[in-house]
């Protein structure tokens, strides 16, 4: 049995330009201790979309549902979507360390942007 699952329930989300996109992610446990980060794309060129403790992400807001009992919610909302935001977004769990170590990624959610 897996000790930690990172779940991105939607494979794809389609949003009209100018609207907001909600990207859902839950983790089954806080253990191992460490942060959740959001990225667009994979590999060394991936773009950091949101980190709770570091950086400035003016268009990104955490929208977790803290009432969830059986898992932890790490969902985000990206406002004022433009075609440049299209891509696949990954919710990634890290194990705390120096530096933090990537542990497990969600399956990804593809964001497509429709014309207004």
């Amino acid at each position: 049995e897996e000790e930690l699952q990172v779940i991105q329930p939607e494979k794809s989300v389609s949003v009209a330009a100018g609207e907001s996109a909600t990207l859902n992610c839950t983790a089954t446990s806080l253990i191992p201790v460490g942060p959740i980060q959001w990225f667009r794309g994979v590999g060394p060129g991936r773009e950091l979309i949101y980190h709770q403790k570091e950086g400035h992400f003016p268009r990104v807001t955490p929208v977790s549902d803290p009432t969830k009992r059986n898992n932890m919610d790490f969902s985000i909302r990206i406002s004022n979507i433009t075609p440049a935001d299209a891509g696949t977004y990954y919710c990634v769990k890290f194990r705390k360390g120096s530096p933090d170590v990537e542990l497990k990624s969600g399956a990804g959610t593809e964001l497509s942007v429709r014309a207004k």
């Epitope: 049995e1 897996e2 000790e3 930690l4 089954t28 446990s29 806080l30 253990i31 191992p32 201790v33 460490g34 942060p35 959740i36 709770q52 403790k53 955490p62 929208v63 977790s64 803290p66 009992r69 059986n70 898992n71 932890m72 919610d73 790490f74 969902s75 985000i76 194990r95 705390k96």
Partner: antibody
């Protein structure tokens, strides 16, 4: 009904060792994060150790790190705390605690008393 | 370490009145909109019992006269109206990403 039953407490001399056990029933033990929390009249509640559901990850505060070792046997629904190099300040009631997400301490056993004294 | 200052240490409230307990963390215990502060009740001779998880969520089976509020560093447990069976010691506990996890010193609630 969730049940956590601790055993193994007792009187031990400073520098000695004890092994606490916790027998779990009434829930899917292998899916839960497990911890020990201790309570003393002077210091109140103090987190002692936590282990992930599969046993891969363990965490301790500095006060017990290197002296206490937490392990689990999911086949036996059991949790163990090996306590070495015991000190007078380790005297406390030790509670076995389960946690669904590793966030809050959801269910507590009745506790077992450890007394470290010469 | 995140230090939790819980106040008051003891509280005497009349039956049917409101009891309010506060916990202040030395730094934020929030992440992704979750506040990792929890509240427990302990009656004499018994282990602690979870009342409120993640600042404001009532644990199953806990009466709704108990409520929790707050975020970041400041949190409150409210019992309204206080009943005789609520006489106990109440503890807050933070389980943020920063170890070690810590508890408040406790608040003993009595009937005035």
């Amino acid at each position: 009904e969730v049940q956590l039953v601790e055993s193994g407490g007792g009187l031990v001399k400073p520098g000695g060792s004890l092994r606490l056990s916790c027998a779990a029933s009434g829930f899917t033990f292998s899916s839960y994060v497990m911890s020990w929390v201790r309570q003393t009249p002077g210091k109140g509640l103090e987190w002692v150790a936590t282990i992930s559901s599969g046993g891969t990850y363990t965490y301790y505060p500095n006060s017990v790190k290197g002296r206490f070792t937490l392990s689990r046997d999911n086949a036996k629904n059991s949790l163990y705390l090996q306590m070495n190099s015991l000190r007078a300040e380790d005297t406390a009631v030790y509670y076995c605690v389960s946690s669904m997400t590793g966030s809050s301490f959801d269910y507590w056993g009745q506790g077992t008393t450890v007394t470290v004294s010469s | 370490d995140i230090v939790i200052t819980q106040s008051p240490a003891s509280l005497a409230v009349s039956l049917g009145e409101r009891a309010t307990i506060s916990c202040r963390a030395s730094e934020s215990v929030d992440s992704y909109g979750n506040s990792f502060m929890h509240w427990y009740q302990q009656k004499p001779g018994q282990p602690p019992k979870l009342l409120i998880y993640r600042a404001s969520n009532l644990e199953s089976g806990v009466p709704d006269r108990f409520s929790g509020s707050g975020s970041r560093t400041d949190f409150t447990l409210t019992i309204n109206p206080l009943q005789a069976e609520d006489v106990a010691t109440y503890y807050c506990h933070q389980s943020s990403e920063q170890l070690p996890w810590t508890f408040g010193g406790g608040t003993k609630v009595e009937i005035k």
